[in-house]
Every structure is written in C-alpha cells, then in structure tokens.
C-alpha cells in the first residue's frame, strides 16, 4: 500500500476507460459508514465521485454529483439528494455518513452539514465491493458510461465503518483525519487503469 499524503489522483480527460480501483478486504456488511475526500472539478454535468458495487448489485453505495450544488447518495439503489450553495469551479471537501439503524444520511460540504435525509433504514451495505474512482459502475467493476465519468482531481480519501461525530468530520476537513479502517489515503491499496496520474495536491 501507498501513503498518498499530499497527493491526488488526476483524471485529466473525459473517458469511458480511465479509473482507479480501490482495494479493501471488507468482509462484513456495512451497517454504518463515513466517507470523506477532497475533489476539484470544473465539470458542470453530472458525474460519479465514488462508486461501490457488489456482485449483482449496482449502486450499492454511490456518491454522485447531479449538478452544481447537488450531491446524491445511493444506498442499495435508493437515492437521496442534498443541496448546498457553492462556488463553481472550486475545490470541495466532501464527507457523507449513513447509519442503518436510523437510515439517516448526512453530507458535510467543506465542514458544514447539509440537511439530513433518510433512506434504506435497516439495510446493510453488502461487503466484498469493487470500488471505483473516475467512473460510475453499472456492473461489478465495469460497464462505464463516459457521460458520468469524472474529470478533475481527487485526494485525501478516507472511509470508516462508523458514523463519525462532527468533531472528527471537522478534523478530516482540516487535514487531520482519524485512522480509517476501510480506506485510508495514508495506506491505500489501489490500481490505476488508463490515463490517471498521481500529482501533488496544490489546491488546499
């Protein structure tokens, strides 16, 4: 694994091929999670930010930007969308958490919580995922769509199997995240596929 501190994945072009696979040995279904990362893109169309599919299950966990100021979370093919006033184009720190017991999903954009939404109460997110950055999966690790591809930069990605309290979300935003036990930017197992380049993070 690699310590990617101070670095980003650059997706320099629109494509149906360029992506990064994130590898995790996640064995147990997820009852809770928090996912945080930084992104910078000048796309105004919709695109996938984080695509997590399991065998036979599309959109098991998907973070998707519908348009400027609108972020969606899919859990088990169900969707909620939260809105925020944001500058465009501008770097953004995104966190999203979901708790099975309540179904509550919450986005945090640049350290600010958006309106909480609810979906899939009681559901467990399947384990043994294929996780893809740069493309939206329509199958287990494949079937990409150019019109949903990400063009830009992604970094500082961490994923925990718990709902982090606000102070920990803020510490991730400020650059001092807790050790993460699903995906950790400081110890990341990944595979680059296609035209994706690792470069220094210069926009925080």
């Amino acid at each position: 694994h690699t310590d990617l501190s101070g670095k980003v994945f650059v997706f320099p072009r629109e494509s149906v091929t360029d992506h990064v696979n994130l590898i995790t040995p996640l064995e147990k279904p997820l009852q809770n999670f928090t996912l945080c990362f930084r992104a910078y893109s000048d796309l105004s169309r919709a695109y996938s930010l984080f695509s997590y599919n399991t065998q036979g299950r599309d959109n098991e966990l998907l973070v998707y930007k519908e348009r400027v100021g609108e972020y969606s979370l899919y859990i088990g093919r169900h969707k909620v969308t939260s809105k925020v006033i944001e500058k465009f184009p501008a770097p953004v720190h995104i966190c999203v958490s979901w708790e099975s017991s309540s179904g509550i999903a919450e986005f945090w954009i640049n350290g600010t919580p958006l309106v909480k939404k609810g979906l899939r109460q009681g559901y467990f997110v399947e384990a043994q995922p294929k996780i893809v950055l740069g493309q939206e999966q329509d199958s287990y690790g494949g079937k990409f769509d150019r019109s949903q591809s990400f063009v830009g930069e992604i970094g500082d990605l961490y994923m925990w199997d718990s709902v982090l309290p606000p102070e920990n979300i803020l510490s991730a935003y400020q650059g001092t995240p807790l050790p993460a036990n699903i995906l950790d930017w400081q110890a990341l197992n990944y595979e680059i596929r296609g035209y994706v380049i690792i470069k220094p993070l210069v926009w925080v």
């Epitope: 694994h1 199997d161 036990n181």
Partner: antibody, heavy 119, light 107 residues
Framework: QVQLQQPGAELIKPGASVKLSCKAS????????MHWVKQRPGQGLEWIGM????????NYNEKFKSKATLTVDKSSSTAYMQLNSLTSEDSAVYYC????????????WGTGTLVTVSS | DIVMTQSQKFMSTSVGDRVSVTCKAS??????VAWYQQKPGQSPKALIY???YRYSGVPDRFTGSGSGTDFTLTITNVQSEDLAEYFC?????????FGSGTKLEIK
C-alpha cells in the same frame, strides 16, 4: 519470512542520545508504515509514533514529540528512532512494529532493544 | 487520549479451562481494537484485529468480541503455552493506546 531485527541492548549515559535501528527483511520495506513502541517493566506498552518509509511522512504521539525522531534508510531497509536527552525514565525496551497491510494493527514486531540509561 | 483499562492484572486458570480477558475503552472506539500476546522474554504477537478477526496462524481457541467500549478476548481449552501477558490496543484515534496488560497464569 518477514523479520524486524533490532540490537539487543544499549547502555547510555544520562543526557546523551541514542539512535536505535530496526532492519526489515522479507517484505517490501517502502510499502508499510513502521511504528515504534516503548515498554517499561510493569508499565505496559506506549505508542511513540510511526513513519512511512516511502513518503517519509510521520505521526508522533504528542508525549514523545520532543523525545523521539523517526527516520528511515530505504537503501538498507532500516528504520531508526533517535532518542535525545535521555533520563532514567527512558530506560525501557523499544520495539519497532509493522502496520498490517489493510488495518491499523501491528502484524510483525521487532525483537526489541533494551535501553538502559545509567551513569 | 483514550484510556484502555484491563482491570484484571492477573488471571489464574487451568489447562483445558476457558478464560476471558476484558478491556474497557474510555470512549467509543467502534471495532478498532487489537489483542496481542507477549510471552516472557519475547516480543508481542498479534492475535486479534478489528475486535473479532483472528490473525493468520492464530489457533481458533482464541476469540475476540465486543465493540464500542467493551472488549473481550476469550481463550477456550487453555493450553500451557498460553502462559503469557495479553494486551488490548485501540487504533480508532491517535495516539494509539494499549491496555496495561493481563498476565495469564496456568495452575
């Protein structure tokens, strides 16, 4: 097999410094975080800090920030910890330990170095 | 810092018995707890990670359980080679912290 080899013992005078070594073998040294842990008799284990040999990124326990300095030599697959201004409180066994591939626990521990601070 | 409390400093058991070593965290650490075994004069060895997953090569008589603040390492069918000190460790927050250890004595 994966091994972390450390010198058995160091005898140091109070006020002096010591540089402890941890030679890794049997795996790709630059791919795993290396941690250092202190063990004083009857006082359990204390986490000192960690270093990633490739990025040379470090993270210290606040308590040891002014006491310990972590470095690596990639060419010899060796991690180092320098301890400065030694006192009797620093007399302990010091272990290096490798972080697991995916999880934040230590799957391989070094043999340990006993540091004795005495005049 | 998170304090990991192992209230039993010593535990006495017999070969073939079942023994449970407990560890309590001062705040929620989710499932981010590991257990280590340290035999006299040796380095610690990993037994359990993520509260309940056995490290490769560890006999299945060692079982970890718990989440949140309360964790247990259970050894069933205790063997003489299990004579050791057992430490819990949280890896949920920096700095990582360890319990003070529980020494298992074989009668």
């Amino acid at each position: 097999q994966v091994q972390l080899q450390q010198p058995g013992a160091e005898l140091i005078k109070p006020g002096a410094s010591v540089k402890l070594s941890c030679k890794a073998s049997g795996y790709t040294f630059t791919s795993y975080w290396m941690h250092w842990v202190k063990q004083r008799p009857g006082q359990g284990l204390e986490w000192i800090g960690m270093i990633h040999p490739n990025s040379v990124n470090t993270n210290y326990n606040e308590k040891f920030k002014s006491k310990a300095t972590l470095t690596v030599d990639k060419s010899s697959s060796t991690a180092y910890m320098q301890l400065n201004s030694l006192t009797s409180e620093d007399s302990a066994v010091y272990y290096c330990a490798r972080r697991n591939d995916y999880y934040w626990y230590f799957d391989v521990w070094g043999t340990g170095t006993l540091v004795t601070v005495s005049s | 810092d998170i304090v990991m409390t192992q209230s039993q400093k010593f535990m006495s058991t017999s070969v073939g018995d079942r023994v449970s070593v407990t560890c309590k965290a001062s705040q929620n650490v989710n499932s981010n707890v590991a257990w280590y075994q340290q035999k006299p004069g040796q380095s610690p060895k990993a037994l359990i990670y993520s509260a309940s997953y056995r490290y490769s090569g560890v006999p299945d008589r060692f079982t970890g359980s718990g989440s949140g603040t309360d964790f247990t390492l259970t050894i069933t069918n205790v063997q003489s080679e299990d004579l050791a000190e057992y430490f819990c460790q949280q890896c949920n927050n920096y700095p990582f912290t360890f319990g003070s250890g529980t020494k298992l004595e074989i009668k």
